[in-house]
């Protein structure tokens, strides 16, 4: 199948990993969400509209 | 059955270069993650040297004694290489290939090495 | 960033428990990105634990991984004679780049 890492999804330093789903991405720490796109605040908020419950800052997403 | 296997592991004067190979069978690296090189001086710990993306990113992280010597990069689906420069008799070691697997929200999780292949350096 | 294990060697007796800590000079990535590895004389090491608490495929649950953060402990019960080897912790880090980091093992002895 088509590598689902080639054009570097993963944002922000963010490691990619092909996985079942299709990819997953390890943020570096300070972003978060699917694609590692969402800086996370310093008082621990996120900029995603609504964040899932239990992310934790740099926590992959898939 | 899921095998990595080194070669190209020999006597090498100081000053001198070489590329180890590392060769996965039973799996392609597109869909396992990234490969990497760790290495073990005779009597001593591990030490990681470097990983490339298993896909066509390229993508490579190298411990910081490692940048500017070794070179890691993928030549197939399923060989990868390590290219040392500028070796010295510190350098001896075996060295090893390893595939970096993401597992529950971790990475560099090493779950699959090849036997290892030895360099030694020495006039 | 340096990890900090046990001196070597620990042994125990047989059906005995040994403990070995591992201390990292700072958090390890998400604060449970740490490995645990076993390896024998003339032998690669074999993944036991990963994120510093759950059990790779096919390692008896006499293996235990616990701790976050900095510090870290591996423990062995019920010790066997197969169990005679030396004990690796490996911590991840992000510091404008994916690092990881070794220590320097720990020598379990079987009596």
């Known amino acids: 199948r088509a590598d689902p890492c080639a054009a570097r999804p993963c944002a922000h330093g963010g490691r990619c990993y092909a996985h079942f789903s299709g990819l997953v991405c390890a943020c570096a720490p300070g972003y978060m969400g699917a694609r590692c796109e969402f800086p996370v605040h310093p008082d621990g908020a996120s900029a995603l509209p609504a964040a899932p419950p239990g992310l934790r800052p740099g926590d992959p997403q898939r | 059955q899921e095998q990595l296997v080194e070669s190209g592991g020999g006597l090498v004067q100081p000053e001198g270069s070489l590329t180890l190979t590392c060769t996965a069978s039973?799996?392609?690296?597109?869909?396992?993650?990234?490969m990497c090189w760790v290495r073990q001086a005779p009597g001593k710990g591990l030490e990681w040297i470097a990983c490339i993306s298993g896909g066509s990113s390229g993508d490579t992280d190298y411990a910081n004694w490692a940048k500017g010597r070794f070179s890691i990069s993928k030549t197939s689906s399923t060989t990868v290489t390590l290219q040392m420069t500028s070796l010295t008799v510190a350098d001896t070691a075996t060295y090893f290939c390893?595939?970096?697997?993401?597992?529950?929200?971790?990475?560099?999780?090493?779950?699959?090495w090849g036997p290892g292949t030895l360099v030694t350096v020495s006039s | 960033q340096v990890l900090t294990q046990t001196p070597s060697p620990v042994s125990a007796a047989v059906g005995g428990t040994v403990t070995i800590s591992c201390q990292a000079s700072q958090s390890v990535y998400n604060n449970n990105n740490l490995a645990w590895y076993q390896q024998k004389p003339g032998q690669p090491p074999k993944l036991l634990i990963y994120a510093a608490s759950s059990l790779a495929s096919g390692v008896p649950s006499r293996f235990k991984g616990s701790g976050a953060g900095t510090q870290f402990t591996l423990t062995i019960s019920d010790l066997e004679c197969d169990d005679a080897a030396t004990y690796y912790c490996?911590?991840?880090?992000?510091?404008?780049?994916?690092?990881?980091?070794f220590g320097g093992g720990t020598e379990v002895v079987v009596k």
């Open positions: 039973g799996f392609s690296f597109s869909s396992s993650g990234y």
């Open positions: 390893a595939r970096d697997v993401y597992i529950d929200s971790t990475i560099f999780n090493f779950n699959l």
């Open positions: 490996q911590g991840t880090y992000y510091s404008s780049g994916w690092y990881s980091t």
